[in-house]
């Protein structure tokens, strides 16, 4: 997946620093207090959706074949989304105020693609 | 996730019949010749992203918290995408013209959500 570098408007991964204190979540998340979560942005022209490594699934490729032939669903915009997310450990208070360590999936955007 | 019923413009699952003959894939896919693959469409207002069951990840919820506070990344559109996909068996010709049966992941959109 592309890294956003200011020179592309295509779907890419933008580095993004997340600080739990800024959103008031530091009252229940103990650690980490911040991390690079990143996000996806940019355009998804038709030729990008369904490209292996860019498409998030077989389904995306099939739907894109329909679009390229002018068939329905032609009106649905292709979307720049995370295609690879990674896990991160967290220490936090649960509902009963116990401290819990959990490996939380989908915390960090590693790659973006058009779906 | 919502089912598209013609009465909502919110992110929902639209039933969609996929026929491999229409996209010329019947020359390598033996079975099935068609199936309901479905797709996602509709708008994603800020309040929908990050709602459990609608958000595709913890990451979505965090980024949405930033948006709701007017912080970056505020300009990135939330996107109606598959949050649950299911597997389907296929019979097809591989590159060496052997007939192969494979359980292909991400063939059918089961639920949609805002990411």
């Amino acid at each position: 997946g592309l890294e956003c570098d200011g020179r592309t408007n295509l779907c890419c991964r933008q580095q993004f620093f997340i600080d739990f204190r800024l959103i008031g979540w530091n009252d229940w998340i103990i650690a980490p207090t911040s991390y690079y979560g990143n996000y996806c942005e940019g355009s998804c022209p038709a030729y990008l959706a369904g490209v292996p490594g860019s498409a998030s699934s077989f389904h995306t490729a099939v739907v894109n074949q329909y679009r390229m032939r002018g068939l329905n669903p032609g009106t649905v915009n292709s979307c720049c989304i995370p295609t690879k997310l990674s896990t991160m450990s967290m220490l936090y208070f649960d509902d009963e105020y116990n401290i819990v360590k959990r490996d939380v999936p989908n915390m960090i955007v590693e790659e973006c693609g058009c779906a | 996730g919502l089912e598209c019923d013609g009465r909502t413009n919110l992110c929902c699952r639209q039933q969609f019949f996929i026929d491999f003959r229409l996209i010329g894939w019947n020359d390598w896919i033996i079975a099935p010749t068609s199936y309901y693959g479905n797709y996602c469409e509709g708008s994603c207002p800020a309040y929908l992203a990050g709602v459990p069951g609608s958000a595709s990840s913890f990451h979505t919820a965090v980024v949405n918290q930033y948006r709701m506070r007017g912080l970056n990344p505020g300009t990135v559109n939330s996107c109606c995408i598959p949050t649950k996909l299911s597997t389907m068996s296929m019979l097809y010709f591989d590159d060496e013209y052997n007939i192969v049966k494979r359980d292909v992941p991400n063939m059918i959109v089961e639920e949609c959500g805002c990411a």
């Epitope: 650690a31 980490p32 911040s34 991390y35 690079y36 990674s86 896990t87 450990s89 116990n98 | -």
Partner: antibody
Framework: EVQLVESGGGVVQPGGSLRLSCAAS????????MHWVRQAPGKGLEWVSL????????YYADPVKGRFTISRDNSKNSLYLQMNSLRTEDTALYYC???????????????????WGQGTTVTVSS | DIQMTQSPSSLSASVGDRVTITCRAS??????LNWYQQKPGKAPKLLIY???SLQSGVPSRFSGSGSGTDFTLTISSLQPEDFATYYC??????????FGQGTRLEIK
Amino acid sequence: EVQLVESGGGVVQPGGSLRLSCAASTFTFDDFAMHWVRQAPGKGLEWVSLITGDGGSTYYADPVKGRFTISRDNSKNSLYLQMNSLRTEDTALYYCVKDWWIAARPDYYYYGMDVWGQGTTVTVSS
Amino acid sequence: DIQMTQSPSSLSASVGDRVTITCRASQSISSYLNWYQQKPGKAPKLLIYAASSLQSGVPSRFSGSGSGTDFTLTISSLQPEDFATYYCQQSYSTPPITFGQGTRLEIK
């Protein structure tokens, strides 16, 4: 079941070298930092060294600094400890240990050791 | 480096007893403390993390408390399989990672 299996221990003379290996199975090896911890006969636990998941950072206890080198090969799910200039006080059972924390940048670790190997014995004697 | 001191270094107790082991850090480590159990001839096992949280699969008779510099591990009703050596470990600072010297729990 997550498993760690050490090998490479043995008897060596003072000033000699040994290379310990640890083979990991059934977990995403490169997600986790790995440690070597040793235990001299009849003594307590002593942390020896640590390497982060990507191999980018390494740390050592003062008694082994400059003599031991920790490394990993994520493609082989393997951890190593190269031990040079061995001393009699290095005699111990050496454990390969998985850390339990999956870190992200900026690297925040809460070091905890949730999976231990069975240990490999290193004897330094003349 | 942060030093960890356990007391007592050994103790004798009977099945059914309530047992407390203490661990003191040379400087404040907040709640970043882990406890391990080691049985003879076996590798250590993580019992408690973050001073008071039970690791998955550990019996509820084990509990931990404390914050700052003083911590305790309590076994509410000693079982035969609990006779072992117990170690505390601080996880507050960057390495070196330090363990306490251990507390050996023996059958009276």
